[in-house]
């Protein structure tokens, strides 16, 4: 899915109002020094691509994130604010339902959620490029469409 035409500000608002708090709840009890953020993103559509991948794609050692509250709210936000997103996710949802029986919090899942928090931080702020190049807010000017 191409996240270029999402309403980034609406997704950011959804993240800050609820999703961020759910991620913190998931990570509660984890030392803040435990994980190094190794996954990065270069602009807002790219950040959403990485966020979708880490949130919904099963990985070795962590197959259960998609049923978490933050994942369901992320899916809802993308469905509402990214035109055509839900249609692309129908097959993926069927596969998810078959694959996941129960929620298990492993160290690998905690690490993955820590990576997610880092990706969302990058999504939420202007891109750190030196003067003369565009930042996230210029991306907004070019690609930001309102969908109601």
């Amino acid at each position: 899915y191409d996240f270029t035409n999402c309403d980034f500000e609406k997704i950011k608002a959804a993240y800050l109002s609820t999703i961020s708090k759910d991620l913190i709840t998931y990570m509660s009890g984890t030392k803040s020094t435990e994980f190094n953020n190794t996954v990065s993103c270069s602009n807002r559509p790219h950040c959403l691509t990485e966020i979708q991948s880490l949130t919904f794609n099963p990985t070795a050692g962590c197959a259960s994130l998609a049923k978490e509250m933050f994942a369901m709210k992320t899916k809802a936000a993308l469905a509402i604010w990214c035109p055509g997103y839900s249609e692309t996710q129908i097959n993926a949802t069927q596969a998810m339902k078959k694959a996941r029986k129960s929620k298990v919090t492993t160290n690998k899942c905690l690490e993955q959620v820590s990576q997610l928090q880092g990706l969302w931080r990058r999504f939420n702020r202007p891109l750190l490029k030196q003067q003369g190049s565009s930042d996230y807010k210029d991306d907004d000017d070019k690609h930001h469409h309102h969908h109601h």
Epitope: L16, T33, F35, N36, G118, R122, N124, R125, Q131
Partner: antibody, heavy 119, light 107 residues
């Protein structure tokens, strides 16, 4: 608990440079941006620039016309701000601050470093 | 650069009364506004992020509102410990910029 501890007060001559350090503890240093803000005596806050310690990316306030350089050393969890071609109006308290968990604010601040520029 | 202009520059309010500080951006900053409190001789402290979200441990008497270019910080019932200078900051576009500050005192 995250802590940012800055280097001590400096007295500098006009035209010289100053390098202020900011050592972070209690969190993963490379995961969060570090910004630098200064405050002249009796004045407001002025944003100087920011660094991503994870990859070294920076963004500077162009008002400083290339006089400011921000760096980070991941091995010691320390950020540095160097200001060159000092003048008397650079006399200020210099603060470092760390990005919060959401990427929309700076929640932990250093204690400040007083830099006095005087001949 | 985006200019953030606060009003008033200083404000005197009686204990228990409401204090309101305004911040106007020279262009839209969406909801990317943060409020900081700075007491004499101390570093700034984060109060409110993304217009209206309370930072951990910030009392409920502090609230933020607004969007686009006009923002407000409200203290519903002023306490003695709220005497400080308050700054808004836009987090929408580099360079990040602060308002000039509003000094809040007790009447």
């Amino acid at each position: 608990e995250v802590q940012l501890v800055q280097s001590g007060a400096e007295v500098k001559k006009p035209g010289s440079s100053v390098k202020v350090s900011c050592k972070a503890s209690g969190g993963t240093f490379s995961n969060y941006l570090i910004e630098w803000v200064r405050q002249a005596p009796g004045q407001g806050l002025e944003w100087m620039g920011v660094i991503d310690p994870g990859n070294g990316d920076t963004n500077y306030n162009e008002n400083f016309k290339g006089r400011v350089t921000i760096t980070a050393d991941k091995s010691t969890s320390t950020a540095y701000m160097e200001l060159s071609s000092l003048r008397s109006e650079d006399t200020a308290v210099y603060y470092c601050a760390r990005e919060d968990n959401t990427g929309t604010a700076f929640d932990y601040w250093g204690q400040g470093t007083t830099v006095t520029v005087s001949s | 650069d985006i200019v953030m202009t606060q009003s008033p520059d200083s404000l005197a309010v009686s204990l228990g009364e409401r204090a309101t500080i305004n911040c106007k951006a020279s262009q839209s900053v969406s909801s990317d506004v943060t409020w900081y409190q700075q007491k004499p001789g101390q570093s700034p402290k984060l109060l409110i992020y993304y217009v209206s979200n309370h930072y951990t441990g910030v009392p409920d008497r502090f609230s933020g509102s607004g969007s686009g270019t006009d923002f407000t910080l409200t203290i519903s019932s002023l306490q003695a410990e709220d005497v400080a200078v308050y700054y808004c900051q836009q987090h929408h576009r580099f360079p990040l910029t602060f308002g000039q500050g509003t000094k809040l005192e007790i009447k």
